[in-house]
């Protein structure tokens, strides 16, 4: 997270980290006791999922292995459209005050809405500095028309843009798949942006979760 600050302790109990061994790979969110939602470009063969602590490496955190993941069937490695994936935990997460399910959206929030993006990704770019504590930054949703002025044809209609004019505030490496939360509901998953991260007036691009709630629910049912 660029130009952010540590999240208020316990304010993101649905935030997870996807680890490769002990190394941060991506962010994600807990949808229920068995399922984590993340970005399709975060796919690996096996995941270790960190839940229940704002601090990576915290011994009190839950660590659960996951071997099965289900990408959206329309994900394109060329255009990066439909960049979302469900990861099935090998064992159930234990819900607590520090481990909660995220609220999936019942509607798409409008441009101008203030939202928070969070993650353990690098706080500097292009040279990396990985924090141990979960970082947060507030950004505003940007209309597709305004975002298309920056990204032209690269922007697909299930992509959502967020940022602050003339500001560096953005996600970065390691934040991928993590949550953009607006008014208490999950509206985006970190997907891509320009590099180095935090170039003013280059918005972050997110998978627009409100367009995929049916696929999320259907996929969890299908692979119960």
């Amino acid at each position: 997270i660029i130009d952010g600050a540590p999240c208020a302790r316990g304010s993101h109990p649905w935030q997870v980290a996807l680890l490769s061994g002990n190394q941060l790979h991506c962010g994600g969110v807990l949808v229920n006791e068995r399922w984590v939602l993340t970005a399709a470009h975060c796919k690996m063969n096996e995941y270790t999922v960190h839940l229940g602590s704002d601090t990576l490496g915290d011994r009190r955190a839950q660590r659960i292995k996951a071997s099965k993941s289900f990408r959206h069937p329309g994900y394109s490695t060329q255009t990066h459209v439909n960049d979302l994936m469900l990861v099935k935990l090998n064992s159930q997460a234990r819900l607590s005050s520090m481990v909660k399910k995220v609220r999936l959206p019942s509607r798409c929030e409008p441009p101008g809405t203030t939202c928070t993006v969070s993650g353990w990704g690098t706080t500097t770019s292009p040279d990396v500095t990985f924090p141990s504590d979960l970082m947060c930054v507030d950004v505003k949703l940007i209309s597709p028309q305004d975002c298309t002025k920056v990204y032209k044809d690269l922007l697909e209609n299930s992509m959502l843009c967020a940022g602050i004019p003339d500001s560096k505030k953005n996600a970065c490496n390691g934040d991928s798949g993590g949550p953009l939360v607006c008014r208490g509901t999950l509206q985006g998953l970190v997907s891509w942006g320009t590099f180095p991260c935090g170039q003013p007036n280059d918005p972050g691009v997110y998978t627009q979760v409100c367009k995929f709630t049916k696929w999320i629910n259907d996929t969890m049912k299908k692979h119960r």
């Epitope: 975060c42 796919k43 690996m44 032209k152 991928s176 997907s191």
Partner: antibody
Framework: QVQLVQSGAEVKKPGASVKVSCKAS????????IHWVRQAPGQGLEWMGS????????NYAQKLQGRVTMTTDTSTSTAYMELRSLRSDDTAVYYC???????????????WGQGTMVTVSS | DIQMTQSPSSLSASVGDRVTITCRAS??????LNWYQQKPGKAPKLLIY???SLQSGVPSRFSGSGSGTDFTLTISSLQPEDFATYYC??????????FGGGTKVEIK
Amino acid sequence: QVQLVQSGAEVKKPGASVKVSCKASGYTFTSEGIHWVRQAPGQGLEWMGSISASSGDTNYAQKLQGRVTMTTDTSTSTAYMELRSLRSDDTAVYYCARSAGYGARHWYFDLWGQGTMVTVSS
Amino acid sequence: DIQMTQSPSSLSASVGDRVTITCRASQSISSYLNWYQQKPGKAPKLLIYGASSLQSGVPSRFSGSGSGTDFTLTISSLQPEDFATYYCDQWYSTPPITFGGGTKVEIK
């Protein structure tokens, strides 16, 4: 030290296959993409394809589709490029290169291997 | 696929000269264009990314400009170590990543 180190020069007969390796060090291999670019003697640069080190997702240049395979071994932080049914016009220096970006999209090559000369001759 | 056309294909210049190389895309690529320098027997090296941003460690005599279809690499005062071949590439519509044909800068 952040670097990509490639395997040594190869001489192959037409119709044979070659497999070039590219070992990464000094950075988290699984967090970046590896691309392969070749350069025939006295010619320009030609993009061959790419692989995501973590997911194994590949994209290949259309003209090489069916003849090229890119793989990675995350346990050794090594990328491989295999080219089959070699022809004389595959004679080139083959480079691996790391792409820079965040998330799903990358934007430029910020690190290159030293190159591997592959000669195809009967 | 987007075609990248570089011009000139070669040029002769003297130390201290101002040198300009152009790269034209067959369709708009916004500012997703990069410039590389390659010396004989060596791998390419990134000079400029995003059309105008100088890569860390690259001397400030190198600069890039342009957006859409027309781009320029300028060397404000050519140094002996700058004699090399220069390539542009585009990352807007990928795959494939496409390179320009190269511009060889030779000593006059």
